[in-house]
Interface confidence: low
Protein backbone atom coordinates (compact mmCIF):
# COMPACT_ATOMS: atom_id res chain seq x y z
CA UNK A 1 0.00 0.00 0.00
CA UNK A 2 1.01 3.63 -0.42
CA UNK A 3 -0.26 7.07 0.55
CA UNK A 4 -1.94 8.93 -2.29
CA UNK A 5 -2.20 12.39 -0.72
CA UNK A 6 0.33 13.06 2.03
CA UNK A 7 -0.59 16.76 2.10
CA UNK A 8 -3.84 15.86 3.80
CA UNK A 9 -1.88 13.97 6.46
CA UNK A 10 0.72 16.59 7.38
CA UNK A 11 -1.23 18.03 10.29
CA UNK A 12 -0.73 15.42 12.98
CA UNK A 13 -1.83 17.42 16.02
CA UNK A 14 -5.50 18.42 16.06
CA UNK A 15 -6.68 20.67 18.90
CA UNK A 16 -10.45 20.89 18.60
CA UNK A 17 -13.03 22.64 20.78
CA UNK A 18 -15.43 20.31 22.55
CA UNK A 19 -18.65 19.54 20.64
CA UNK A 20 -16.98 19.97 17.24
CA UNK A 21 -16.64 17.30 14.57
CA UNK A 22 -13.24 15.74 13.88
CA UNK A 23 -12.22 14.14 10.60
CA UNK A 24 -8.96 12.22 10.09
CA UNK A 25 -7.97 11.12 6.58
CA UNK A 26 -5.42 8.58 5.35
CA UNK A 27 -5.84 8.52 1.54
CA UNK A 28 -4.17 5.37 0.21
CA UNK A 29 -3.94 3.07 -2.74
CA UNK A 30 -2.43 -0.25 -3.72
CA UNK A 31 -2.87 -3.42 -5.68
CA UNK A 32 -4.84 -5.24 -4.53
CA UNK A 33 -6.82 -2.33 -3.05
CA UNK A 34 -5.91 -2.17 0.66
CA UNK A 35 -8.33 -2.05 3.57
CA UNK A 36 -8.29 0.46 6.41
CA UNK A 37 -8.81 0.06 10.14
CA UNK A 38 -8.39 2.45 13.05
CA UNK A 39 -6.70 2.19 16.44
CA UNK A 40 -7.08 4.45 19.43
CA UNK A 41 -4.00 4.62 21.63
CA UNK A 42 -2.68 1.51 19.90
CA UNK A 43 -5.77 -0.61 20.49
CA UNK A 44 -8.65 -1.54 18.21
CA UNK A 45 -11.09 1.38 18.10
CA UNK A 46 -14.61 0.07 18.61
CA UNK A 47 -17.91 1.89 18.14
CA UNK A 48 -18.80 1.36 21.78
CA UNK A 49 -15.64 3.16 22.89
CA UNK A 50 -17.38 6.51 22.52
CA UNK A 51 -20.90 7.82 22.98
CA UNK A 52 -22.47 8.13 19.55
CA UNK A 53 -19.82 5.91 17.99
CA UNK A 54 -17.98 7.11 14.90
CA UNK A 55 -18.20 6.91 11.12
CA UNK A 56 -15.71 5.42 8.71
CA UNK A 57 -15.89 6.54 5.07
CA UNK A 58 -13.86 3.88 3.32
CA UNK A 59 -14.14 5.55 -0.06
CA UNK A 60 -12.65 8.71 1.46
CA UNK A 61 -10.21 6.87 3.73
CA UNK A 62 -11.59 8.85 6.68
CA UNK A 63 -12.64 8.56 10.30
CA UNK A 64 -15.31 10.99 11.53
CA UNK A 65 -16.19 11.67 15.18
CA UNK A 66 -19.04 14.06 15.87
CA UNK A 67 -19.49 16.17 18.98
CA UNK A 68 -16.13 15.33 20.53
CA UNK A 69 -15.71 15.29 24.31
CA UNK A 70 -12.61 15.26 26.53
CA UNK A 71 -12.60 11.45 26.70
CA UNK A 72 -11.95 11.42 22.94
CA UNK A 73 -8.43 12.78 23.51
CA UNK A 74 -5.67 10.45 22.36
CA UNK A 75 -3.72 8.99 19.45
CA UNK A 76 -5.63 7.74 16.43
CA UNK A 77 -3.80 5.46 14.03
CA UNK A 78 -4.99 4.43 10.59
CA UNK A 79 -3.65 1.07 9.48
CA UNK A 80 -3.84 0.47 5.74
CA UNK A 81 -3.01 -3.05 4.63
CA UNK A 82 -3.23 -5.66 1.91
CA UNK A 83 -1.65 -9.05 1.44
CA UNK A 84 1.70 -7.46 0.60
CA UNK A 85 2.08 -5.34 3.71
CA UNK A 86 0.78 -2.46 5.76
CA UNK A 87 1.42 1.23 6.40
CA UNK A 88 0.15 3.40 9.23
CA UNK A 89 -0.16 7.00 10.25
CA UNK A 90 -0.96 8.49 13.67
CA UNK A 91 -2.89 11.63 14.55
CA UNK A 92 -3.07 13.16 18.01
CA UNK A 93 -6.39 14.63 19.10
CA UNK A 94 -6.65 17.16 21.90
CA UNK A 95 -10.15 18.26 22.89
CA UNK A 96 -10.14 21.81 24.20
CA UNK A 97 -12.79 22.59 26.78
CA UNK A 98 -13.87 26.19 26.71
CA UNK A 99 -15.60 27.53 29.79
CA UNK A 100 -19.02 28.57 28.56
CA UNK A 101 -19.98 32.14 29.42
CA UNK A 102 -23.13 34.19 29.45
CA UNK A 103 -24.03 35.69 26.08
CA UNK A 104 -22.05 38.64 24.77
CA UNK A 105 -23.83 41.21 22.63
CA UNK A 106 -22.01 43.23 19.99
CA UNK A 107 -21.56 46.81 21.13
CA UNK A 108 -23.78 49.34 19.41
CA UNK A 109 -26.47 46.85 18.50
CA UNK A 110 -29.35 47.13 18.35
CA UNK A 111 -28.92 50.65 16.97
CA UNK A 112 -31.35 53.52 17.41
CA UNK A 113 -33.63 54.00 14.44
CA UNK A 114 -35.96 56.65 13.08
CA UNK A 115 -38.75 56.30 10.56
CA UNK A 116 -41.95 57.94 9.41
CA UNK A 117 -45.43 56.69 10.18
CA UNK A 118 -46.13 53.87 7.76
CA UNK A 119 -42.45 53.07 7.33
CA UNK A 120 -40.55 49.90 8.07
CA UNK A 121 -37.65 49.49 10.48
CA UNK A 122 -35.30 46.72 11.51
CA UNK A 123 -33.41 46.16 14.75
CA UNK A 124 -30.47 43.75 14.81
CA UNK A 125 -28.92 42.07 17.83
CA UNK A 126 -25.61 40.30 17.23
CA UNK A 127 -25.07 37.50 19.75
CA UNK A 128 -21.94 35.59 20.72
CA UNK A 129 -22.57 32.56 22.90
CA UNK A 130 -20.81 29.21 23.42
CA UNK A 131 -23.98 27.65 24.77
CA UNK A 132 -27.29 27.68 22.90
CA UNK A 133 -28.58 31.26 23.17
CA UNK A 134 -32.22 32.27 23.36
CA UNK A 135 -33.23 35.70 22.20
CA UNK A 136 -36.14 37.85 23.29
CA UNK A 137 -37.22 41.20 21.95
CA UNK A 138 -39.02 43.17 24.64
CA UNK A 139 -40.76 46.53 24.46
CA UNK A 140 -41.89 48.91 27.14
CA UNK A 141 -45.65 49.20 26.83
CA UNK A 142 -48.49 51.06 28.45
CA UNK A 143 -51.15 49.48 30.60
CA UNK A 144 -54.21 51.51 31.55
CA UNK A 145 -52.51 54.60 30.17
CA UNK A 146 -49.39 54.16 32.28
CA UNK A 147 -45.90 52.94 31.35
CA UNK A 148 -45.17 51.98 34.94
CA UNK A 149 -46.82 49.73 37.46
CA UNK A 150 -47.67 50.67 41.04
CA UNK A 151 -44.19 49.53 42.08
CA UNK A 152 -42.59 52.03 39.71
CA UNK A 153 -41.32 49.35 37.34
CA UNK A 154 -42.03 49.46 33.61
CA UNK A 155 -44.58 47.28 31.90
CA UNK A 156 -42.83 44.97 29.42
CA UNK A 157 -44.12 42.97 26.48
CA UNK A 158 -42.26 40.15 24.74
CA UNK A 159 -42.57 40.81 21.00
CA UNK A 160 -40.52 37.96 19.62
CA UNK A 161 -38.38 35.14 20.91
CA UNK A 162 -36.25 32.43 19.42
CA UNK A 163 -37.61 28.93 19.36
CA UNK A 164 -40.29 27.09 17.54
CA UNK A 165 -42.04 29.75 15.49
CA UNK A 166 -39.36 32.41 15.13
CA UNK A 167 -36.91 32.52 12.28
CA UNK A 168 -33.88 34.79 12.45
CA UNK A 169 -34.54 35.86 16.02
CA UNK A 170 -31.54 38.21 15.94
CA UNK A 171 -33.61 40.54 13.76
CA UNK A 172 -36.78 42.34 14.83
CA UNK A 173 -38.60 43.78 11.83
CA UNK A 174 -41.42 46.30 12.26
CA UNK A 175 -43.63 47.07 9.31
CA UNK A 176 -46.03 49.95 8.69
CA UNK A 177 -45.16 51.49 12.04
CA UNK A 178 -47.44 53.82 13.92
CA UNK A 179 -46.71 56.41 16.59
CA UNK A 180 -47.53 53.77 19.18
CA UNK A 181 -44.51 51.77 18.04
CA UNK A 182 -42.11 54.48 19.20
CA UNK A 183 -40.12 53.66 22.31
CA UNK A 184 -37.38 51.45 23.68
CA UNK A 185 -36.75 47.97 22.27
CA UNK A 186 -34.69 45.56 24.35
CA UNK A 187 -32.75 42.60 23.01
CA UNK A 188 -32.43 40.15 25.90
CA UNK A 189 -30.33 37.04 25.35
CA UNK A 190 -29.93 34.14 27.75
CA UNK A 191 -28.13 30.83 27.87
CA UNK A 192 -27.79 28.38 30.72
CA UNK A 193 -25.02 30.46 32.29
CA UNK A 194 -26.83 33.77 32.44
CA UNK A 195 -28.19 36.63 30.37
CA UNK A 196 -27.34 39.97 28.80
CA UNK A 197 -29.40 42.73 27.26
CA UNK A 198 -29.02 45.91 25.21
CA UNK A 199 -31.62 48.30 23.94
CA UNK A 200 -32.35 50.81 21.20
CA UNK A 201 -34.91 53.52 20.63
CA UNK A 202 -37.35 53.91 17.79
CA UNK A 203 -38.30 57.51 17.12
Amino acid sequence: PYWTNTEKMEKRLHAVPAANTVKFRCPAGGNPMPTMRWLKNGKEFKQEHRIGGYKVRNQHWSLIMESVVPSDKGNYTCVVENEYGSINHTYHLDVVERSPHRPILQAGLPANASTVVGGDVEFVCKVYSDAQPHIQWIKHVEKNGSKYGPDGLPYLKVLKHSGINSSNAEVLALFNVTEADAGEYICKVSNYIGQANQSAWLT
Partner: antibody, heavy 120, light 107 residues
Framework: DVHLQESGPGLVKPSQSLSLTCSVT?????????WNWIRQFPGNKLEWMGY???????NYNPSLKNRLSITRDTSKNQFFLQLSSLTTEDTATYFC?????????????WGTGTTVTVSS | SIVMTQTPKILLVSAGDRVTITCKAS??????VAWYQQKPGQSPKLLIY???NRYTGVPDRFTGSGYGTDFTFTISTVQAEDLAVYFC?????????FGSGTKLEIK
Protein backbone atom coordinates in the same frame (compact mmCIF):
# COMPACT_ATOMS: atom_id res chain seq x y z
CA ASP B 1 -53.67 19.97 23.88
CA VAL B 2 -50.33 18.93 25.28
CA HIS B 3 -50.31 16.34 28.06
CA LEU B 4 -47.45 14.95 30.11
CA GLN B 5 -47.76 11.77 32.15
CA GLU B 6 -45.19 10.30 34.50
CA SER B 7 -44.89 6.57 35.15
CA GLY B 8 -42.59 4.38 37.19
CA PRO B 9 -42.32 2.35 40.37
CA GLY B 10 -43.89 3.68 43.54
CA LEU B 11 -41.46 1.93 45.86
CA VAL B 12 -37.71 1.59 45.50
CA LYS B 13 -35.11 0.23 47.89
CA PRO B 14 -32.19 2.33 49.13
CA SER B 15 -29.00 2.12 47.00
CA GLN B 16 -31.05 1.08 43.97
CA SER B 17 -31.73 3.22 40.89
CA LEU B 18 -34.97 4.96 39.99
CA SER B 19 -36.23 4.99 36.42
CA LEU B 20 -39.17 7.18 35.46
CA THR B 21 -40.83 7.83 32.12
CA CYS B 22 -42.61 10.97 30.96
CA SER B 23 -44.92 10.33 28.02
CA VAL B 24 -45.79 13.40 25.99
CA THR B 25 -48.88 13.62 23.81
CA UNK B 26 -50.03 16.47 21.60
CA UNK B 27 -46.55 17.82 20.86
CA UNK B 28 -43.29 16.42 19.53
CA UNK B 29 -40.45 16.70 22.03
CA UNK B 30 -38.07 17.39 19.13
CA UNK B 31 -40.04 20.40 17.88
CA UNK B 32 -39.24 22.72 20.74
CA UNK B 33 -39.23 23.34 24.48
CA UNK B 34 -36.99 22.02 27.24
CA TRP B 35 -38.30 18.90 28.96
CA ASN B 36 -37.74 18.92 32.72
CA TRP B 37 -37.88 16.78 35.80
CA ILE B 38 -38.88 18.47 39.04
CA ARG B 39 -39.48 16.81 42.37
CA GLN B 40 -41.43 17.83 45.44
CA PHE B 41 -40.41 16.59 48.84
CA PRO B 42 -42.76 15.98 51.75
CA GLY B 43 -43.37 19.43 53.18
CA ASN B 44 -43.81 20.95 49.68
CA LYS B 45 -40.20 21.92 48.83
CA LEU B 46 -39.72 21.89 45.04
CA GLU B 47 -36.39 21.01 43.43
CA TRP B 48 -35.59 21.38 39.75
CA MET B 49 -33.56 18.32 38.74
CA GLY B 50 -32.64 18.89 35.11
CA TYR B 51 -33.85 18.93 31.54
CA UNK B 52 -33.28 17.56 28.08
CA UNK B 53 -33.76 20.05 25.26
CA UNK B 54 -35.62 19.57 21.99
CA UNK B 55 -32.26 18.93 20.33
CA UNK B 56 -31.08 16.43 22.93
CA UNK B 57 -28.78 18.55 25.10
CA UNK B 58 -28.85 18.22 28.88
CA ASN B 59 -28.59 20.51 31.86
CA TYR B 60 -28.56 19.03 35.35
CA ASN B 61 -28.79 20.46 38.83
CA PRO B 62 -25.19 20.24 40.13
CA SER B 63 -26.48 18.78 43.40
CA LEU B 64 -27.60 15.71 41.41
CA LYS B 65 -25.15 15.71 38.52
CA ASN B 66 -23.27 12.54 39.49
CA ARG B 67 -26.47 10.55 40.04
CA LEU B 68 -28.84 11.89 37.40
CA SER B 69 -29.31 11.08 33.76
CA ILE B 70 -32.10 12.39 31.53
CA THR B 71 -32.53 10.74 28.15
CA ARG B 72 -35.25 10.43 25.55
CA ASP B 73 -36.81 8.15 22.96
CA THR B 74 -37.97 10.38 20.14
CA SER B 75 -39.79 7.55 18.37
CA LYS B 76 -42.04 7.11 21.40
CA ASN B 77 -42.13 10.83 22.27
CA GLN B 78 -40.93 10.04 25.77
CA PHE B 79 -38.16 11.29 28.01
CA PHE B 80 -36.71 9.53 31.01
CA LEU B 81 -35.18 10.11 34.40
CA GLN B 82 -32.63 7.80 35.90
CA LEU B 83 -31.46 8.54 39.44
CA SER B 84 -28.90 6.23 41.01
CA SER B 85 -27.77 5.45 44.57
CA LEU B 86 -31.10 6.27 46.12
CA THR B 87 -31.52 7.14 49.78
CA THR B 88 -34.64 7.83 51.81
CA GLU B 89 -33.97 11.53 51.10
CA ASP B 90 -35.06 10.89 47.51
CA THR B 91 -38.61 10.12 48.63
CA ALA B 92 -40.71 12.67 46.75
CA THR B 93 -43.35 13.27 44.13
CA TYR B 94 -41.67 13.49 40.73
CA PHE B 95 -43.11 15.76 38.05
CA CYS B 96 -42.17 16.20 34.43
CA UNK B 97 -42.79 19.63 32.96
CA UNK B 98 -41.91 21.64 29.91
CA UNK B 99 -40.44 25.13 29.72
CA UNK B 100 -40.33 27.18 26.52
CA UNK B 101 -36.64 27.75 26.97
CA UNK B 102 -34.09 28.88 29.45
CA UNK B 103 -34.97 32.29 30.82
CA UNK B 104 -38.62 32.17 29.75
CA UNK B 105 -39.80 31.82 33.32
CA UNK B 106 -42.60 29.45 32.60
CA UNK B 107 -43.15 25.77 33.23
CA UNK B 108 -46.47 25.96 31.46
CA UNK B 109 -47.43 22.29 31.29
CA TRP B 110 -46.85 19.75 34.08
CA GLY B 111 -47.59 16.08 34.48
CA THR B 112 -49.78 14.95 37.35
CA GLY B 113 -46.77 13.62 39.25
CA THR B 114 -45.79 10.19 40.47
CA THR B 115 -45.00 9.45 44.10
CA VAL B 116 -41.80 7.56 44.81
CA THR B 117 -40.98 6.15 48.22
CA VAL B 118 -37.47 4.97 48.99
CA SER B 119 -37.63 2.42 51.74
CA SER B 120 -36.24 -0.98 52.59
CA SER C 1 -27.10 28.56 43.35
CA ILE C 2 -29.61 31.38 43.80
CA VAL C 3 -31.73 31.15 46.93
CA MET C 4 -35.32 32.38 46.70
CA THR C 5 -36.47 33.37 50.18
CA GLN C 6 -40.25 33.40 50.24
CA THR C 7 -42.37 34.90 53.03
CA PRO C 8 -44.60 34.26 54.82
CA LYS C 9 -44.86 30.48 55.17
CA ILE C 10 -48.57 30.57 56.01
CA LEU C 11 -51.22 33.22 55.41
CA LEU C 12 -54.52 33.06 57.23
CA VAL C 13 -57.11 34.78 55.08
CA SER C 14 -60.79 35.41 54.68
CA ALA C 15 -62.66 35.62 51.40
CA GLY C 16 -62.32 39.14 50.03
CA ASP C 17 -58.96 39.82 51.65
CA ARG C 18 -56.02 41.28 49.77
CA VAL C 19 -52.90 39.18 50.24
CA THR C 20 -49.28 39.79 49.38
CA ILE C 21 -46.44 37.27 49.18
CA THR C 22 -42.83 38.33 48.78
CA CYS C 23 -39.83 36.58 47.35
CA LYS C 24 -36.26 37.80 47.69
CA ALA C 25 -33.50 36.44 45.45
CA SER C 26 -29.98 36.08 46.83
CA UNK C 27 -28.69 37.86 43.70
CA UNK C 28 -30.24 39.69 40.79
CA UNK C 29 -32.44 37.56 38.56
CA UNK C 30 -33.59 40.39 36.27
CA UNK C 31 -37.32 39.74 35.77
CA UNK C 32 -36.92 35.99 35.23
CA VAL C 33 -39.37 35.06 37.97
CA ALA C 34 -42.57 33.07 37.82
CA TRP C 35 -45.31 32.34 40.37
CA TYR C 36 -47.17 29.04 40.62
CA GLN C 37 -50.29 27.90 42.40
CA GLN C 38 -50.57 24.33 43.69
CA LYS C 39 -53.79 22.94 45.06
CA PRO C 40 -53.82 19.75 47.17
CA GLY C 41 -53.20 16.64 45.08
CA GLN C 42 -52.47 18.63 41.93
CA SER C 43 -49.37 19.75 40.06
CA PRO C 44 -48.31 23.41 40.17
CA LYS C 45 -50.01 25.76 37.71
CA LEU C 46 -48.32 28.77 36.17
CA LEU C 47 -49.91 32.10 37.10
CA ILE C 48 -47.28 34.79 36.44
CA TYR C 49 -44.14 34.84 34.30
CA UNK C 50 -41.49 37.51 33.63
CA UNK C 51 -42.35 38.74 37.14
CA UNK C 52 -45.48 40.60 36.08
CA ASN C 53 -47.08 38.91 33.08
CA ARG C 54 -50.26 36.94 33.68
CA TYR C 55 -50.35 33.55 31.99
CA THR C 56 -53.20 32.73 29.60
CA GLY C 57 -56.53 32.41 31.38
CA VAL C 58 -55.30 33.64 34.77
CA PRO C 59 -57.80 36.00 36.44
CA ASP C 60 -56.69 39.61 36.81
CA ARG C 61 -56.94 39.48 40.59
CA PHE C 62 -53.51 37.81 40.44
CA THR C 63 -50.67 40.25 39.87
CA GLY C 64 -46.90 40.16 40.14
CA SER C 65 -44.23 42.80 40.24
CA GLY C 66 -40.53 43.25 40.88
CA TYR C 67 -37.14 43.31 39.26
CA GLY C 68 -33.66 42.32 40.34
CA THR C 69 -33.92 40.77 43.79
CA ASP C 70 -37.31 41.75 45.23
CA PHE C 71 -40.56 40.34 43.95
CA THR C 72 -44.17 40.55 45.08
CA PHE C 73 -47.21 38.45 44.28
CA THR C 74 -50.64 39.81 45.13
CA ILE C 75 -54.18 38.46 45.14
CA SER C 76 -56.37 41.54 45.20
CA THR C 77 -59.54 39.83 46.42
CA VAL C 78 -59.10 36.30 47.71
CA GLN C 79 -61.74 33.77 46.69
CA ALA C 80 -62.39 30.33 48.16
CA GLU C 81 -60.83 28.59 45.15
CA ASP C 82 -57.56 30.46 45.74
CA LEU C 83 -56.73 28.37 48.80
CA ALA C 84 -53.51 26.67 47.77
CA VAL C 85 -49.74 26.82 48.11
CA TYR C 86 -47.97 29.50 46.07
CA PHE C 87 -44.36 29.27 44.91
CA CYS C 88 -41.97 31.72 43.34
CA UNK C 89 -39.34 30.43 40.94
CA UNK C 90 -36.31 31.83 39.13
CA UNK C 91 -34.86 30.54 35.90
CA UNK C 92 -32.39 33.36 35.37
CA UNK C 93 -29.41 31.22 36.31
CA UNK C 94 -29.03 27.46 36.42
CA UNK C 95 -29.81 25.62 38.60
CA UNK C 96 -33.37 26.90 38.59
CA UNK C 97 -34.68 27.35 42.12
CA PHE C 98 -38.01 27.73 43.89
CA GLY C 99 -39.15 29.52 46.98
CA SER C 100 -40.24 27.38 49.91
CA GLY C 101 -43.93 28.09 49.34
CA THR C 102 -46.70 30.07 51.03
CA LYS C 103 -49.82 28.26 52.14
CA LEU C 104 -53.11 30.17 52.06
CA GLU C 105 -55.49 28.94 54.77
CA ILE C 106 -58.91 30.07 55.88
CA LYS C 107 -58.99 31.92 59.20
Amino acid sequence: DVHLQESGPGLVKPSQSLSLTCSVTGYSITSGYYWNWIRQFPGNKLEWMGYITYDGSNNYNPSLKNRLSITRDTSKNQFFLQLSSLTTEDTATYFCARVYYYGSGNFDVWGTGTTVTVSS
Amino acid sequence: SIVMTQTPKILLVSAGDRVTITCKASQSVSNDVAWYQQKPGQSPKLLIYYASNRYTGVPDRFTGSGYGTDFTFTISTVQAEDLAVYFCHQDHTSPFTFGSGTKLEIK
